[in-house]
Amino acid sequence: PRNDTCPELPEIPNGWKSPSQPELVHGTVVTYQCYPGYQVVGSSVLMCQWDLTWSEDLPSCQRVTSCHDPGDVEHSRRLISSPKFPVGATVQYICDQGFVLMGSSILTCHDRQAGSPKWSDRAPKCLLEQLKPCHGLSAPENGARSPEKQLHPAGATIHFSCAPGYVLKGQASIKCVPGHPSHWSDPPPICRAASLDGFYNSRSLDVAKAPAASSTLDAAH
């Protein structure tokens, strides 16, 4: 054996080294990697040192027997059967109240012939529960509402008005309050006939002046 090189590096079970035929001189770096389903135990990078010894002990390739942490899901809690997620472990996701689960609630860590163990599914999502709209209120008798829709989304406001000669009793505007279920902030108002005195006192008399006869007017008629 030469005395100016590091010792020959062997192949390792269930893995390989690169380069496969390294020069064994000082400064040479050799990297060990494992086949799918195995992971490096020890240092994967070895370097030929000044004193012609390798910087680290030879690593080994160990079978991967667990899944990676599938992670937390926003707006949820999770129940874990085994903290290191070995094959057979389960993770159950439960959405916080007001959120709806999209995907699988329970994931199971499964072994695979080739490659590392894998979760039965990807982590789910917890989406905000859709707030139900408020049902449209009918316009008060002798009045109107705007907008005139059958369903009003949570947060929307509707406005009420009364026909001439009627006054509004109640709230002129009411809101669809978001909730489970969504609900109107107030009962719908009513339109009450104004007293005749009040009706006349509240109005001034406008006299409209008729336009002078003109050829334009004649033409229009």
Epitope: L79, G98, I106, E129, G179
Partner: antibody, heavy 120, light 106 residues
Framework: EVQLQQSGPELMKPGASVKMSCKAS????????MHWVKQNQGKSLEWIGE????????GYNQKFKGKATLTVDKFSSTAFIELRSLTSEDSAIYYC?????????????WGAGTTVTVSS | QIVLTQSPAIMSASPGEKVTMTCSAS?????MHWYQQKSGTSPKRWIY???KLASGVPARFSGSGSGTSYSLTISSMEAEDAATYYC?????????FGSGTKLEIK
Amino acid sequence: EVQLQQSGPELMKPGASVKMSCKASGYTFTDYNMHWVKQNQGKSLEWIGEINPNTGGTGYNQKFKGKATLTVDKFSSTAFIELRSLTSEDSAIYYCTRGGYDHYWYFDVWGAGTTVTVSS
Amino acid sequence: QIVLTQSPAIMSASPGEKVTMTCSASSSVSYMHWYQQKSGTSPKRWIYDTSKLASGVPARFSGSGSGTSYSLTISSMEAEDAATYYCQQWSSTPPTFGSGTKLEIK
């Protein structure tokens, strides 16, 4: 009738561990998650964590991680809570309580509670 | 975590009187649940999903609210209603409880 029967009171020394039990009857044990709630003397309630009796899966309030361990014995329909490294702060009533079926956000049946007193 | 503040902390009411207690959340929640606890006993589920009465709860009880403001109302106080009432949310993990309203009979 659905019942949760809890073990008797415990008088413990600081630094010790205690394990309490909660035996369920009157329903299918594996259909409902079991929760544990702490109530300090004359104070409010704190959720410790829960366990799914079917999978053994557990979830904890961050505050009680490392303090409490939840387990179940499916065959005897019993849930357990173990508290370690006890201090006077752990003196309280501990309730086991059942989560709602397919409705995981409230507690529908409660045990009578186990009183734990930590004193030297 | 969401903090639930109950008010008043202590209140008293005469038989037949209307009683309202409130639970205010530090962040918006979707639903609120309420528990009744009498001295020396464990809590009982009383109102769930904001307004649904648990089995056996008298119809004089009602619950309402949305967002950060919820309330429990007794339309006509009776002696057996004297207890401490706790609100609870799970719109965010961990679930949290209010500090309780102690209701006494005058």
